[in-house]
Amino acid sequence: QEDEDGDYEELVLALRSEEDGLAEAPEHGTTATFHRCAKDPWRLPGTYVVVLKEETHLSQSERTARRLQAQAARRGYLTKILHVFHGLLPGFLVKMSGDLLELALKLPHVDYIEEDSSVFAQSIPWNLERITPPRYRADEYQPPDGGSLVEVYLLDTSIQSDHREIEGRVMVTDFENVPEEDGTRFHRQASKCDSHGTHLAGVVSGRDAGVAKGASMRSLRVLNCQGKGTVSGTLIGLEFIRKSQLVQPVGPLVVLLPLAGGYSRVLNAACQRLARAGVVLVTAAGNFRDDACLYSPASAPEVITVGATNAQDQPVTLGTLGTNFGRCVDLFAPGEDIIGASSDCSTCFVSQSGTSQAAAHVAGIAAMMLSAEPELTLAELRQRLIHFSAKDVINEAWFPEDQRVLTPNLVAALPPSTHGAGWQLFCRTVWSAHSGPTRMATAVARCAPDEELLSCSSFSRSGKRRGERMEAQGGKLVCRAHNAFGGEGVYAIARCCLLPQANCSVHTAPPAEASMGTRVHCHQQGHVLTGCSSHWEVEDLGTHKPPVLRPRGQPNQCVGHREASIHASCCHAPGLECKVKEHGIPAPQEQVTVACEEGWTLTGCSALPGTSHVLGAYAVDNTCVVRSRDVSTTGSTSEGAVTAVAICCRSRHLAQASQELQ
């Protein structure tokens, strides 16, 4: 069918003279995609965030928006451009019919379009009881400066800024972007409207019950009186922060996002951009007793995502739900019956529970750490938060069985002193998303931009996997795990470390011809072995068992099954030294572990032999864990014997640098 669209390509309503760029077609071979919230009741059809390609200028964004309006008008559709984004993400927010999505997706510069959706405050319940005065803890930490060099932005409800706890500490910005309250009979009541934000501001920086008593805060209103907001409103809030940062650069910034909505590509992308601009973002994991990866901004890798525990270090239950969990959670923090400022009166206190409260604790801790060390990067701060956390105190039985291994058993704690951690080699474990069950499925785990991938391992609950390998992707190493035929899927597990001035590479040995097994070592001068990986193409590795002990004098060597290719991660960094530590059990065991000693950090974790009854290996804090199939299925043959291989490293250079500072 012939359509005379060409006649109207110059159609730019109200801006008739501007005709440049209107005839452009989308770049060849690129297809924009449409995304919407997986949780139907949270969807907001009729409002869309049109995200443009990364290098798009503001003028092009405006022109694209006008072009959409013009082409829509020609089809008889009304549209309204609600906001043009720039500074964080290029794009625009448009109110339009869903009928126009196909048209909008074909516009030049469009990367993807996301339907707007709701986000919610993550505290339950509100206004339980008034407790005046607040309870004091005898062991309450009294920091010297309490985060005074740091500014904490709070994106939440309105707040009662004249509350005794936060008066003079919180500056209420003029930013407000909230949806209408639901229900025709809803009455706005100031104390209810301010409840959530006031409490959280108190938890972060309150005079009596605050974590970082010296921190100054700025509040942005993105949640209405019912604690409900939108992804688009949150995006515009984050953009406001970025613009404020550019106009008036201050010291370190912490952004607290005590809210959650369904998984949102655009919200995660905005968080990533802000994080890469040097801002520390802390968010609530969510109160849905669910995988935090299904929610945003909790699922954004650059954000510090916080789950909630109670005074007994147990995961918080909230009615029929509770704290979220899983690989997208970085750590947990107190989130049950937390005493804080109540908006009922200027001296009232109240207890609230939820992952919002937990996130506020971590935002306070972050503010204090940054105040003590303002030059800390996001990666350094995250690693320190993990390092100083209480380990292995959470009862994992509360989590669904398949999530236990993925969920960090860490409860946030203030560092014993604000200085003196610089000598430490910090590492953390990053799990990939599940690969899915298809034969060729793979899973990829990535480290943060300023972290080094020092080792890569894999894990499959069924044991059907084809190992893992480190490979370059976009100029950085990533960890890729491979599923096997009949497998239910795999996880890739990256060991991500802070190693300044590191130069790391991967050395590979193809499957060996000889029966002795495959081996590879770090042959470059000054390079030390930080991790071993193995990958095989065969569906089922045989029971061939290579010699477990390495030849003397060759610590920089990875050994593995003769049918597998072996990959050694070899790094050169000032003062870096590493050693291999093995723990073998001759009888079949479901779990074998080996830990690094005090002063050494686990960088690599792998299993010997790599036979098919080994489910995989992964690092938990400073311990290497190797899991095998249920003993009852393997019998007690020598095939059941497994060795856990840990590579433990330390940096004399970091230790010296730290001593020089003191």
Epitope: Q1, L11, A14, G76
Partner: antibody, heavy 114, light 108 residues
Framework: QVQLVESGGGLVQPGGSLRLSCAAS????????MHWVRQAPGKGLEWVSN????????YYADSVKGRFTISRDNSKNTLYLQMNSLRAEDTAVYYC???????WGQGTLVTVSS | DIVLTQSPATLSLSPGERATLSCRAS???????LAWYQQKPGQAPRLLIY???SRATGVPARFSGSGSGTDFTLTISSLEPEDFAVYYC?????????FGQGTKVEIK
């Protein structure tokens, strides 16, 4: 070229029903809002109803609400107006128009008289 | 509802003269959705101006539109014999869509 052809008009008694059709060609019919506009003899233009490209959204003038129903069949490139409980004041030439009213049909006359 | 009032009801002019037609809205109208039509006896309306000021395809340059908010104008710089007709303004940015009552441009 774009063409809109109305049909189905005629003489009908008050209280009766009629179904108008508008056959579209020369453009991607499902992309466009479509409208019905009427003009009583010697009078001005009056908008009657419209429907979105997918058919999911419809609007009506107060004067016809509850009596007229707009619909479309995108597979047949046809717009419809089902008119029930017709009154004398519904007598007019009925036009279908596309999108931003850039193309109109030639109109079909509906006469409501006893 | 947005009421559009056109003035004058009738405009008597000679060919070559300038015609100025006014359309006033009872409340502010988004000018993106303000249009002008020409209708001759026995014919369907024809779109002249969309977006308050943009000429539709094939419309001679002597036709121009202007205005914003509540006041809009259609100007015919020099009347040609074929321009004598009825002219309607219309807003379609709000439901119900409304038309002005029309201005008849007749030969003096």
């Amino acid at each position: 070229q774009v063409q809109l052809v109305e049909s189905g008009g005629g003489l009908v008694q008050p209280g009766g029903s009629l179904r108008l059709s508008c056959a579209a060609s020369g453009f991607t019919f499902s992309d466009y809002y479509m409208h019905w506009v009427r003009q009583a003899p010697g009078k001005g233009l009056e908008w009657v109803s419209n429907i979105s490209g997918s058919g999911s959204t419809t609007y009506y003038a107060d004067s016809v609400k509850g009596r007229f129903t707009i619909s479309r069949d995108n597979s047949k490139n046809t717009l419809y107006l089902q008119m029930n409980s017709l009154r004398a004041e519904d007598t007019a030439v009925y036009y279908c128009a596309r999108g931003m009213f850039d193309f109109w049909g030639q109109g079909t006359l509906v006469t409501v008289s006893s | 509802d947005i009421v559009l009032t056109q003035s004058p009801a009738t405009l008597s002019l000679s060919p070559g003269e300038r015609a100025t037609l006014s359309c006033r809205a009872s409340q502010s109208v988004n000018s993106n959705y303000l249009a002008w039509y020409q209708q001759k006896p026995g014919q369907a309306p024809r779109l002249l101006i969309y977006g308050a000021s943009s000429r539709a395809t094939g419309v001679p340059a002597r036709f121009s539109g202007s205005g914003s908010g509540t006041d809009f104008t259609l100007t015919i710089s020099s009347l040609e014999p074929e321009d004598f007709a009825v002219y309607y303004c219309q807003q379609w940015g709000d439901v119900p869509i409304t038309f002005g009552q029309g201005t008849k441009v007749e030969i003096k």
